[in-house]
Interface confidence: medium
């Protein structure tokens, strides 16, 4: 069958019909519907929303919509024993206590079940001690403290500002430094953009606003009690002591009003430089402990949260493909929120809902996609990407054989300045071509393409006239599909101007103030940016599911592999003497990249010329494209991170949100000058070069002529 037998309309008209059916007003309506009450993972409210979405997707016309449930480890505050932090005097009396919850936003005063700010999966504990300010608690911040300033965090409670890196990495770093507790806070320098008012008068964080979030270091494991396998009815669960990624010290988040009270008394060392100073009217002294008059006062944490195995629900919708039903294109985003989820995740869920509605409308008119499209509403993303990971673990054999692509659909907006795309290089050309066909929603770009406004506002640092596309890291539901299973993945959303807004994420991220009104009043009153994101995400899914030849260009992988090889080589060349001493050579890697480039070029030529009416040859060529991403998977995984198996990309070991290229080599080289056994350390570098070179060569060979 050719793809036109799947439909009674021409392919070009299909895409136009699909895009024309997407309506901003519907996205707005869906967002409102999804944000009126909290939908915390594991709660009845989120189960009810799952059933509502299941019902609506069926109404929209999907072939089947099922709930997939798992029993996973979640974490909740104790309702009768709230978490807080105190300053205590020498008699042990609490002379200051942090806020027990955020003051509710106007109109939401009587909403029940707003979970107070907490760090999910924090152990219980009531440590008390001197405070040390550790800036962002990054690896380099602890290097500065311990190596340059000779400040010992052992037995101290550290206070770190949110931003720059994933909070779980901060906690891991604090644990490794010997801290006995961690206080996380939002500094106005990072979460209060100059010239903008705080909510409800603007989109900035008020002093009482607090960022919730998990503090796990799962490294792709999913449910901490069932790593590698689904948390189903007959699962064998680890004991809590053997659980993956749980923090070992109490952690709690606060807002900047409370942080002011803790930081204003700090004594000890002055901040090492201006990069350690935020925007509060405090000295940003590092400590340890309080200054002069307050030196006998200590900080005490009171953490009483509990970890509980709880049922979660994914919604999985299927639109069966007419020609290749055994090839899956997946569009997935999460449904669970910390509170109202005005941006995260419901701005994404509302877009997915409208995409499903549009596909359903076409299906009701007699159309079907060439390939099967799976739609997913994931649960428990906020607790460690649990819903998506458990489902992928349960369906891994199908996915690794049939998975064409995964498009992620969390928050549609984190700003309203320009498009932001992170994806596999295989999708670069798809994204470029699609955005050239879409209209820009940006002011000053009326009648211009999205590609044009995006390129102007976010130019590629390497290629002139092209937009920036970033590497995939983690911190979202594509992780298991890309990093573990090697399924080509991508994500798109509207973002802020990173040049002028240096704060981390958006100010109200994971706070109670992330409401429908935040989006409707301040970010996207016309919902035009949401519509554009729907067109990009939906358009990518449409092309991936419907184009006769998969819209992947393997030559773009060749280009980035060369760039990444150059980068890792230059990092290694900072140690020329050791490279000589230990005979470290990158020749094998550069040779493999050269081979990949030549083979990819020849494959692309064959792709232009082959007989597309021959279904066997077509399927063969498409399979080579589909399985290319899979070829970068090392079944043994990265050192100490068995579920990060992609050799070209992994989440940074220092920041889960960021992607690192050739992560095995990068980690082997990191801080190598401080290793006690240099011979062993450089031996590991050589081993990682070998693994990378072999993998690139093996991937290249999957693109060679089959016989």
């Amino acid at each position: 069958k050719s793809s036109n037998e799947a439909t009674n309309i021409t392919p070009k008209h299909n895409m136009k019909a699909f895009l024309d059916e997407l309506k901003a007003e519907n996205i707005k309506k869906f967002l409102y519907n999804f944000t009126q009450i909290p939908h915390l993972a594991g709660t009845e409210q989120n189960f009810q929303l799952a059933k509502q979405i299941q019902s609506q997707w069926k109404e929209f016309g999907l072939d089947s919509v099922e709930l997939a449930h798992y029993d996973v480890l979640l974490s909740y505050p104790n309702k009768t024993h709230p978490n807080y932090i105190s300053i205590i005097n020498e008699d042990g009396n609490e002379i200051f206590n942090t806020s027990l919850f955020e003051p509710p936003p106007p109109g939401y005063e009587n909403v029940s079940d707003i979970v107070p700010p907490f760090s999910a999966f924090s152990p219980q504990g009531m440590p008390e001690g001197d405070l040390v300010y550790v800036n962002y608690a990054r690896t380099e911040d602890f290097f500065k403290l311990e190596r340059d300033m000779k400040i010992n965090c052992s037995g101290k409670i550290v206070i770190a500002r949110y931003g720059k890196v994933f909070r779980g990495n901060k906690v891991k770093n604090a644990q490794l430094a010997g801290a006995k507790g961690v206080i996380l806070y939002s500094d106005p320098a990072d979460y209060f953009a100059p010239g903008v008012k705080s909510y409800p008068d603007g989109w900035n964080l008020p002093g009482g606003g607090v960022q919730r979030g998990n503090i796990l270091n799962l490294n792709g494991a999913g449910d901490p009690l069932t790593p590698g396998y689904p948390a189903n009815e007959y699962a064998y669960r680890r004991g809590i002591a053997e659980a993956v990624g749980l923090p070992s010290i109490p952690v709690h988040p606060i807002g900047y009003y409370d942080a002011q009270k803790l930081l204003e008394k700090m004594g000890g060392s002055a901040p090492p430089d201006s990069s350690w100073r935020g925007s509060l009217k405090v000295p940003y002294n590092v400590g340890p402990g309080f200054t002069g008059n307050f030196s006998t006062q200590k900080v005490k944490m009171h953490i009483h949260s509990t970890n509980e195995v709880t049922r979660i629900y994914n919604v999985i919708g299927t639109l069966r493909g007419a020609v290749e039903p055994d090839r899956y294109v997946i569009l997935g985003g999460h449904r669970d929120s910390w509170v109202f989820g005005g941006i995260d995740p419901q701005s994404g869920a509302a877009v997915v809902h409208e995409i499903v509605r549009s596909f359903g409308t076409l299906k009701k008119e007699g159309w079907r996609p060439r390939r099967t499209i799976l739609f997913a509403s994931w649960d428990a993303e906020e607790f460690g990407l649990l819903g998506s990971t458990e489902w992928a673990e349960e369906n891994s054999r199908l996915l690794q054989e049939r998975g064409v692509a995964y498009i992620n659909a969390d928050s549609s907006i984190e700003g309203n300045y320009t498009l932001r795309v992170d994806c596999t290089p295989l999708m670069y050309s798809l994204v470029h071509n699609l955005t050239k066909e879409l209209k820009s929603p940006d002011e000053g770009f009326e009648g211009k393409s999205l590609y044009e406004s995006w390129t102007k506002k976010s130019p590629s640092p390497e290629f002139s006239g092209m937009p920036r596309i970033s590497k995939l890291g983690s911190g979202n539901d594509f992780e298991v599909f890309f990093q573990r299973l090697g399924i080509a993945s991508g994500r798109a959303r509207y973002t802020k101007n990173w040049e002028t807004n240096k704060f981390s994420g958006y100010p109200l991220y994971h706070s109670v103030y992330e409401t429908y009104e935040l989006v409707e009043k301040f970010y996207d009153p016309m919902f035009k940016y949401h519509l554009t994101v729907a067109q990009v995400r939906g358009g990518m899914v449409f092309e991936l599911a419907n184009s006769i030849v998969l819209p992947f260009d393997c030559r773009d992988y060749a280009v980035v592999l060369r760039k990444y090889a150059d980068k890792i080589y230059s990092i290694s060349m900072k140690h020329p003497q050791e490279m000589k001493t230990y005979s470290v050579s990158f020749d094998s890697l550069f040779s493999a990249v050269k081979n990949f480039t030549e083979i990819a070029s020849k494959f692309s030529e064959r792709l232009q010329d082959f007989d597309k009416s021959n279904p066997i040859v077509l399927r063969m060529m498409n399979d080579q494209l589909m399985f290319l991403e899979r070829a970068f998977i090392d079944p043994l995984g990265l050192p100490d991170r068995p579920f990060y198996r992609h050799v070209i990309y992994a989440p940074s070991s220092h920041n889960k949100y960021a992607g690192e290229s050739f992560p095995g080599i990068y980690d082997a080289l990191f801080d190598i000058e401080s290793k006690v056994d240099p011979s062993k350390a450089w031996g590991e570098v050589k081993r990682q070069i070998y693994v990378a070179a072999f993998t690139v060569q093996a991937a290249a060979e999957t693109l060679s002529e089959v016989a």
């Epitope: 003051p103 008020p206 002093g207």
Partner: antibody, heavy 120, light 106 residues
């Protein structure tokens, strides 16, 4: 020194109007919500109205909404309360107060008050 | 609107005695705030967010409570503590104060 100074109080007949002013000094006026709170003779405190940073949002005691208007002029570091159709029960000391935050509603700085007497 | 009821309305206490003032809300509130007012003076912020003492407030004062029931406690009353104390909620508009508790020194 952080200071709030009210003015504009006095004796007015029922049905009359009065405009109270509050001059702020010693802090960045535009960074704070502001409020009026009143206290009838021998009685307790009663919140009258709040205004956000730039005056775009105002909040009133329901029973006063139609007669009282809170406003501000950030350029002049001034807060105002326009009171129309005054009644005997509006007789009180009117305090201008700084609201530390739009949520916590913690009135951390108060003026000395200005007396309004409504009597024929 | 949320009604705050203080008890007692009036209390006459001897120095060094422990004093508790109750504030009951007609529906649950996030936090309670307390102010002290002396005759012919403006109110002064005294306790914010239920349990935190405003700047300059002696440590013999403390605040506690949650939901609908809140308490201001003076551990060992001193003469300078004679005043009227008001509780206030900011959970929802309209903002409301309690009717006040007048503390007199015997």
């Amino acid at each position: 020194e952080v200071q709030l100074v009210e003015s504009g109080g006095g004796l007015v007949q029922p049905g009359g109007s009065l405009r109270l002013s509050c001059a702020a000094s010693g802090f960045t006026f535009s960074d704070y919500y502001m409020a009026w709170v009143r206290q009838a003779p021998g009685k307790g405190l009663e919140w009258v109205a709040n205004i956000n940073y730039d005056g775009s949002s105002t909040y009133y005691l329901d029973s006063l909404k139609s007669r009282f208007t809170i406003s501000r002029d950030n350029a002049k570091n001034s807060l105002y309360l326009q009171m129309n159709s005054l009644r005997a029960e509006d007789t009180a000391v009117y305090y201008c107060a700084r609201d530390l935050d739009g949520y916590y509603g913690y009135f951390d700085v108060w003026g000395q008050g200005t007396t309004v007497t409504v009597s024929s | 609107q949320i009604v705050l009821t203080q008890s007692p309305d009036f209390q006459s206490v001897t120095p060094k005695e422990k004093v508790t003032i109750q504030c009951s809300a007609s529906s649950s509130v996030s936090y309670m705030y307390w102010y002290q007012q002396k005759p012919d003076q403006s109110p002064k912020p005294w306790i914010y967010r239920t349990s935190n003492l405003a700047s300059g407030v002696p440590s013999r004062f403390s605040g506690s409570g949650s939901g609908t029931d809140y308490t201001l406690t003076i551990n060992s009353l001193e003469a300078e503590d004679a005043a009227t104390y008001y509780c206030q909620q900011y959970h929802s508009y309209p903002l409301t104060f309690g009717q006040g508790t007048k503390l007199e020194i015997k």
